[in-house]
């Protein structure tokens, strides 16, 4: 016979998995925050930038109120998923003018691969269904200049921010319906 | 040594509007994230503005948000915080202070402050 | 907006004893991002810890910080006079940028 069976695994409080989950959020976003306002200070650009690649923004603040846990976190993976393309995009094909943010873009993505594992590992604790694997999405055309560069930059980093600052949010809320 | 001179303080009517300068020295100017920090006569510190080095990105605190200008003169190492439409809860002792080396690290060095007061 | 309550209000110690300083933050808050002051009466603050525990530059070894999530402490080991002052927390995770209302150190 084999060895005597251990102590039931006890599965972790799915709160203290959320709490990790809204720092490393939070975290991400204070990065994400600060790294666009160092882009801007060495590019300054005026205006709104947008990059049609990009995933729409999750929800309003105000629609907070209407969201349920297993969307909220299936929605926040898909759209971290495609920040997390588009940012290996920026570092790959952004051009001489990035690379002097080359290590705060390569935190930023280590750092966004965490949370979408740590998303991961919340959803299987939570036992909510796995999404289906992502279809392989359109590669992502290189910025036509330099300027180009910056610009996807700033959108990206602009998106993120807002995405994130949704997530913290609505992850805080859903925590009080656990 | 890092030093942050504040000047421009003073008595002021409501409604009216102060200039308050920051002289820095001993450090890089232009390589600092810089920021207005307040206190009440008797009461704790409340945050007011920041501005990146480069001054493209700032923030206000709600309290001071379309009233209060956050500025920075890189070539003569000078901060300012232009204070329109000045109220009675203004009033406090205003420090200019530098962050450390990176954002997350706290306010690591101050002025000794410039005391506006704001009564009629 | 991110508040920070400290507590106690007031403390009453005497030289030599260890003072207990706490900071209970309204949001979970990574431990990075809390930062703790000392200020006397008409002089400007002075940051002594920042990322939570980390001793800022000439601050004596008395002085150490723990804590994550949404409780931080500042501990003084064995309180030397100068160390009668009032203390802040503070984050700078989110902005606006706060403070806790400040824990006066009193000498009993």
């Known amino acids: 016979p084999g060895p005597p069976p251990g102590p039931p695994r006890v599965s972790p409080d799915p709160r203290a998995e959320l709490d990790s989950t809204v720092l490393l959020t939070r975290s991400l976003l204070a990065d994400t925050r600060q790294l666009a306002a160092q882009l801007r200070d060495k590019f300054p650009a005026d205006g709104d930038h947008n990059l049609d690649s990009l995933p729409t923004l999750a929800m309003s603040a105000g629609a907070l109120g209407a969201l349920q846990l297993p969307g909220v976190l299936t929605r926040l993976r898909a759209d971290l998923l495609s920040y997390l393309r588009h940012v290996q995009w920026l570092r790959r094909a952004g051009g001489s003018s990035l690379k002097t943010l080359e290590p705060e873009l390569g935190t930023l993505q280590a750092r966004l691969d965490r949370l979408l594992r740590r998303l991961q590992l919340l959803m299987s604790r939570l036992a909510l269904p796995q999404p289906p694997p992502d279809p392989p999405a359109p590669p992502l055309a290189p910025p036509s200049s330099a300027w180009g560069g910056i610009r996807a930059a700033l959108a990206i980093l602009g998106g993120l921010h807002l995405t994130l600052d949704w997530a913290v949010r609505g992850l805080l809320l859903l925590k009080t319906r656990l | 040594e890092v030093q942050l001179v504040e000047s421009g303080g003073g008595l002021v009517q409501p409604g009216g509007s102060l200039r308050l300068s920051c002289a820095a020295s001993?450090?890089?100017?232009?390589?600092?994230?810089m920021h207005w920090v307040r206190q009440a006569p008797g009461k704790g510190l409340e945050w007011v503005a920041y501005?990146?080095?480069?001054?493209?990105?700032?923030y206000y605190a709600d309290t001071v948000k379309g009233r209060f200008t956050i500025s920075r003169d890189n070539a003569k190492n000078s901060l300012y915080l232009q204070m329109n439409s000045l109220r009675a809860e203004d009033t406090a002792v205003y420090y200019c202070?530098?962050?450390?080396?990176?954002?997350?690290?706290?306010?690591?060095?101050w002025g000794q402050g410039t005391l506006v007061t704001v009564s009629s | 907006e991110i508040v920070l309550t400290q507590s106690p209000a007031t403390l009453s110690l005497s030289p030599g004893e260890r003072a207990t300083l706490s900071c209970s933050v309204s949001d979970l808050i990574p431990s990075q991002y809390l930062s703790w002051y000392q200020q006397k009466p008409g002089q400007a603050p002075r940051l002594l810890i920042y990322?939570?525990?980390n001793l800022a530059s000439g601050i004596p070894a008395r002085f150490s910080g723990s804590g994550s999530g949404t409780d931080f402490t500042l501990t003084i080991s064995s309180l030397e006079p100068e160390d009668f002052a009032v203390y802040y927390c503070?984050?700078?995770?989110?902005?606006?940028?706060?403070f806790g209302q400040g824990t006066k150190l009193e000498i009993k």
């Open positions: 501005i990146t080095p480069g001054s493209n990105t700032i």
């Open positions: 202070a530098r962050e450390y080396y990176s954002y997350d690290e706290g306010f690591a060095y």
């Open positions: 503070q984050q700078g995770v989110d902005v606006p940028f706060t």
């Open positions: 001993g450090f890089t100017f232009s390589s600092f994230g």
């Open positions: 990322r939570t525990s």
